[in-house]
């Protein structure tokens, strides 16, 4: 299953990055799980994950650094609290969970650049 | 199963990166699991993961650094808490979980760049 996501995203000065994860036509998929993975070298770590259905909105856990909305086969993801050290490749993994058959696809990743703002000068 | 994701994403100064993960036609997949992996050299670490259905929204765990939304075969992922040291290749892995048969696909990865901002100059 094909998963598309932007190649590069520049996080805002507030440390928030948003991007769209789009997957191949879901057909009759009723439950879809989206996972954002961060790849550092050969290591992949899960940043966040959420499941949504055709009737319910995308819902991340309360303490998740991610938020988002879904529309058809597109998921608008927003990651907050980003720091320059978080710059890296973020991979969107989409799983069509139910009903059978199960399909899974991973995007090529979105390079997210986070630039820490320079400290403001002190005022005398 | 083909998974598409952007090649590069620049994270915001807040350490948040968003991108779209798109996977091949899911047919009647009802449950999809998306995992974002971070590749560092030969090592892959899971950044985040979430399962969603056609009826329930994408949902990452509460403590996940990711948020996102889904739309058909596209997932908009947002990763929060990114740091410059997190810069790397993030692979989107999509698994069509249910109903059978099981399908899995991984994107080529999205290079996410996180840039730490320079310190602000002092004022005299």
């Amino acid at each position: 299953m094909h998963v598309a996501q932007p190649a590069v995203v520049l996080a805002s000065s507030r440390g928030v990055a948003s991007f769209v994860c789009e997957y191949g036509s879901s057909g009759n998929a009723a439950e879809v799980r989206v996972t954002v993975l961060r790849q550092a070298g050969s290591q992949m770590t899960e940043v966040c994950a959420a499941t949504y259905t055709v009737e319910d909105e995308l819902a991340f856990l309360d303490d998740s650094t991610c938020t988002g909305t879904s529309s058809g086969n597109k998921v608008n993801l927003t990651i907050q609290g980003l720091r320059a050290m978080d710059t890296g490749l973020y991979i969107c993994k989409v799983e069509l969970m139910y009903p059978p058959p199960y399909y899974v696809g991973m995007g090529n990743g979105t390079q997210i650049y986070v630039i820490d703002p320079e400290p403001c000068p002190d005022s005398d | 199963m083909h998974v598409a994701q952007p090649a590069v994403v620049l994270a915001s100064s807040r350490g948040v990166a968003s991108f779209v993960c798109e996977y091949g036609s899911s047919g009647n997949a009802a449950e999809v699991r998306v995992t974002v992996l971070r590749q560092a050299g030969s090592q892959m670490t899971e950044v985040c993961a979430a399962t969603y259905t056609v009826e329930d929204e994408l949902a990452f765990l509460d403590d996940s650094t990711c948020t996102g939304t889904s739309s058909g075969n596209k997932v908009n992922l947002t990763i929060q808490g990114l740091r410059a040291m997190d810069t790397g290749l993030y692979i989107c892995k999509v698994e069509l979980m249910y109903p059978p048969p099981y399908y899995v696909g991984m994107g080529n990865g999205t290079q996410i760049y996180v840039i730490d901002p320079e310190p602000c100059p002092d004022s005299d």
Partner: antibody
Framework: QIQLVQSGPELKKPGETVKISCKAS????????VSWVKQAPGKGLRWMGW????????TYVDDFKGRFAFSLETSASTAFLQINNLKNEDTAIYFC?????????WGQGTTLTVSS | DVLMTQTPLSLPVSLGDHASISCKSS???????????LEWYLQKPGQSPKLLIY???KRFSGVPDRFSGSGSGTDFTLKISRVEAEDLGVYYC?????????FGGGTKLEIK
Amino acid sequence: QIQLVQSGPELKKPGETVKISCKASGYTFTTYGVSWVKQAPGKGLRWMGWINTYSGMPTYVDDFKGRFAFSLETSASTAFLQINNLKNEDTAIYFCARRGISFDYWGQGTTLTVSS
Amino acid sequence: DVLMTQTPLSLPVSLGDHASISCKSSQSIVYINGNTYLEWYLQKPGQSPKLLIYKVSKRFSGVPDRFSGSGSGTDFTLKISRVEAEDLGVYYCFQGSHVPWTFGGGTKLEIK
């Protein structure tokens, strides 16, 4: 509102063919699969299989392979159940049902009577 | 195939009583993703079945809170806290975890 409306009752002879329709409204037809369920007189419910309304691919339970065929007319948001070479044991009420993660909406049922 | 066994076959009750219906599967119906697609339907005479509960314990929209579902693995239960006249009919459990999906044989809830 969401509705599944089935065609009317049918009286057929053994060996004949019947085609039952199930017209959906109130939602995007190709988003949900359509299942077919058989209920013989005085009996319980039996899932016959389903058809992927996006791809058109049908899945049949073993007992309903051969003489049974699911099909679609997507432009009319309609699913069909065709039964060939009818037998007396095909006498039953046939339901169509929308399925996402459950059979949340059902047709009213079509009564098929097969008698010589 | 997964066999779904319901008990009792018939359940005579008085209005206002509590009612409990059991459904046992011949094997675990936990799907590979960890979810259990166990549902309960009510069919009244001359009508099509209506969804009450899905994913073991989630009430469908519009279903009164006197209906509740519970269970895990292979043992599941539907409870009605206070039976009303409109609750009479045949209750079916259903598993959608393993193809072919299967219904239980049904439990008839009737007045004593």
